[in-house]
C-alpha cells in the first residue's frame, strides 16, 4: 500500500486516551521518550498528539477509476520531530526522532469500529494494532474483524483548543 501524496490531507491536535479513559502520556527520560498509560489526576493537563492523515491506495484488484480503494494512514507526533513507531520485532510501540520522509514504521492504518473511537493498524505488519498491555502501549495481533472491537486496541481522540505543537 502506497501513500498517494507526500503531504497530509489534514492534521489536528488531540489528546489520546484508552477506551477506559486512561491517558496516553509521554515523558522524556535519559534523552529518550517513554510512553505511559495512566490515570491522570483531576485537572492534570493531558498530553497532545499531532495526528497527520495521509491517503493511501489499497493494493486490490478492484475495478474502477482509482477513486475507490483508498484508506487513511496516520502518523502520531507528541512532540516536534518525534513520531510513534511500530517495532514489529519487539511487539512494541516506541517514540523515535525521524526526518521526513518518515519510515513505514511510523504509519498506521486508521480504523474506527465505533463512532467515538479509533484503532491504529501497523502499516508494516497488517493485522497488528497499537494496544494497551500492562500500562504500556504494545503491538497486539488481532485475528479477525470481530476482535476489532476489543477494548484494548480502542482509543479516544479528544479535541484540544491549543493549536501549537510543542
Amino acid at each position: 500500500m502506497s501513500i498517494t501524496g507526500i503531504s497530509p490531507i489534514t492534521e489536528y491536535l488531540a489528546s489520546l486516551s484508552t477506551y477506559n479513559d486512561q491517558s496516553i502520556t509521554f515523558a522524556l527520560e535519559d534523552e529518550s521518550y517513554e510512553i505511559y498509560v495512566e490515570d491522570l489526576k483531576k485537572d492534570e493537563k493531558k498530553d497532545k498528539v499531532l495526528l497527520s492523515y495521509y491517503e493511501s491506495q489499497h493494493p486490490s484488484n478492484e475495478s474502477g477509476d482509482g477513486v475507490d480503494g483508498k484508506m487513511l494512514m496516520v502518523t502520531l507526533s507528541p512532540t516536534k520531530d518525534f513520531w510513534l513507531h511500530a517495532n514489529n520485532k519487539e511487539h512494541s510501540v516506541e517514540l523515535h526522532k525521524s526526518e521526513k520522509p518518515l519510515p513505514d514504521q511510523a504509519f498506521f492504518v486508521l480504523h474506527n469500529m465505533h463512532s467515538n473511537s479509533v484503532s491504529f493498524e501497523s502499516k508494516t505488519d497488517p493485522g497488528v494494532f497499537i494496544g494497551v498491555k500492562d500500562n504500556h502501549l504494545a503491538l497486539i495481533k488481532v485475528d479477525s474483524s470481530e476482535n476489532l472491537s476489543t477494548e484494548n486496541i480502542l482509543f479516544k481522540l479528544s479535541e484540544t483548543h491549543h493549536h501549537h505543537h510543542h
Epitope: 490531507i9 489534514t10 489536528y12 488531540a14 492523515y53 491517503e55 489499497h58 486490490s60 478492484e62 475495478s63 474502477g64 477513486v67 475507490d68 480503494g69 483508498k70 484508506m71 487513511l72 492504518v109 486508521l110 480504523h111 474506527n112 469500529m113 465505533h114 463512532s115 467515538n116 474483524s145 470481530e146 476489532l148 472491537s149 479535541e159 483548543h161
Partner: antibody, heavy 121, light 106 residues
Framework: EVQLVETGGGLVQPGRSLKLSCKTS????????MYWIRQAPGKGLEWVSS????????YYPDSVKGRFTISRDNAENTIYLQMSSLRSEDTATYFC??????????????WGQGSLVTVSS | DIQMTQSPSVLSASVGDRVTLSCKAS??????LDWYQQKVGEAPKLLIY???NLQTGIPSRFSGSGSGTDYTLTISSLQPEDVATYFC????????FGQGTKVEIK
C-alpha cells in the same frame, strides 16, 4: 465501477413496516462503513443510520431509534433498512451510501439513486 | 449533538461570479467536514472532503476552507452546471448535515 442500487420502496400505511435493500458492486464491500440517508420531498438531507464494516455496531439518530434497524450481509454485498411503526414524517427518498475510505466512518464517497417511501393512509 | 447551520439558504449569482457558501458547526469539528452537491432529481455527490480536499473528477473551481467551527465552500467562477443545492456534512462526532444552500443563476 462502484454501484449502489436501492429497492423496496413504495406506499405503506402508518404503523406498518417496510424493508429497504441496497445491493452493491464494484468495491470490497466488507471493508466499508455503510449508511442510509433520507430526504423528505423538497427538504434537506437527514442521516438515518450507519453500520460498521463487520456489522458489529450500528448507529441511529433519535428520530428513528427503536423503529429502524440497519443490517448487512457481507456475502451478498447488501445492506438493509428494516423500518417499523412508520409515520407520515418518514416519507422520503432513502439513499444508501458507502464510506469514502476503507475501515473509517469519514465521508460518503458514493450514493445510490434512492428509493421513495411514502407513508400515507 | 452537533448542529450545522448553512448560510445563505438561497444564493443568486451571475455566471463567472465568485460564490461563497458558509457552514457553521455548534462545536469544533476538527476539519471533519465535507461538501456535497445535489442537482434536481439526482443523488448527492461528494465534492470536497476533510474541509479542503477535492474529490476526483470535480472541477478545480471548487475549493473548501475552514477550521474549528467555521467552514466555507467557494466556487471561483460560477458556471451554469453549478446550479444545485450544496450541503455541508460533519463526521467528527456522529453525522450531521447542514440544511443546504440553493445556488441559482441570476
Amino acid at each position: 465501477e462502484v454501484q449502489l442500487v436501492e429497492t423496496g420502496g413504495g406506499l405503506v400505511q402508518p404503523g406498518r413496516s417496510l424493508k429497504l435493500s441496497c445491493k452493491t458492486s464494484g468495491f470490497t464491500f466488507s471493508s466499508y462503513w455503510m449508511y442510509w440517508i433520507r430526504q423528505a420531498p423538497g427538504k434537506g438531507l437527514e442521516w438515518v443510520s450507519s453500520i460498521t464494516p463487520n456489522g458489529g455496531n450500528t448507529y441511529y439518530p433519535d428520530s428513528v431509534k427503536g423503529r429502524f434497524t440497519i443490517s448487512r450481509d457481507n456475502a451478498e454485498n447488501t445492506i438493509y433498512l428494516q423500518m417499523s411503526s412508520l409515520r407520515s414524517e418518514d416519507t422520503a427518498t432513502y439513499f444508501c451510501a458507502k464510506g469514502h475510505y476503507y475501515y473509517t466512518s469519514y465521508s460518503l464517497g458514493y450514493w445510490g439513486q434512492g428509493s421513495l417511501v411514502t407513508v400515507s393512509s | 449533538d452537533i448542529q450545522m447551520t448553512q448560510s445563505p439558504s438561497v444564493l443568486s449569482a451571475s455566471v463567472g461570479d465568485r460564490v461563497t457558501l458558509s457552514c457553521k458547526a455548534s462545536h469544533n469539528i476538527n476539519k471533519h467536514l465535507d461538501w456535497y452537491q445535489q442537482k434536481v432529481g439526482e443523488a448527492p455527490k461528494l465534492l470536497i472532503y476533510f474541509t479542503n480536499n477535492l474529490q476526483t473528477g470535480i472541477p478545480s473551481r471548487f475549493s473548501g476552507s475552514g477550521s474549528g467551527t467555521d467552514y466555507t465552500l467557494t466556487i471561483s467562477s460560477l458556471q451554469p452546471e453549478d446550479v444545485a443545492t450544496y450541503f455541508c456534512f460533519q463526521y467528527n462526532s456522529g453525522w450531521t448535515f447542514g440544511q443546504g444552500t440553493k445556488v441559482e443563476i441570476k
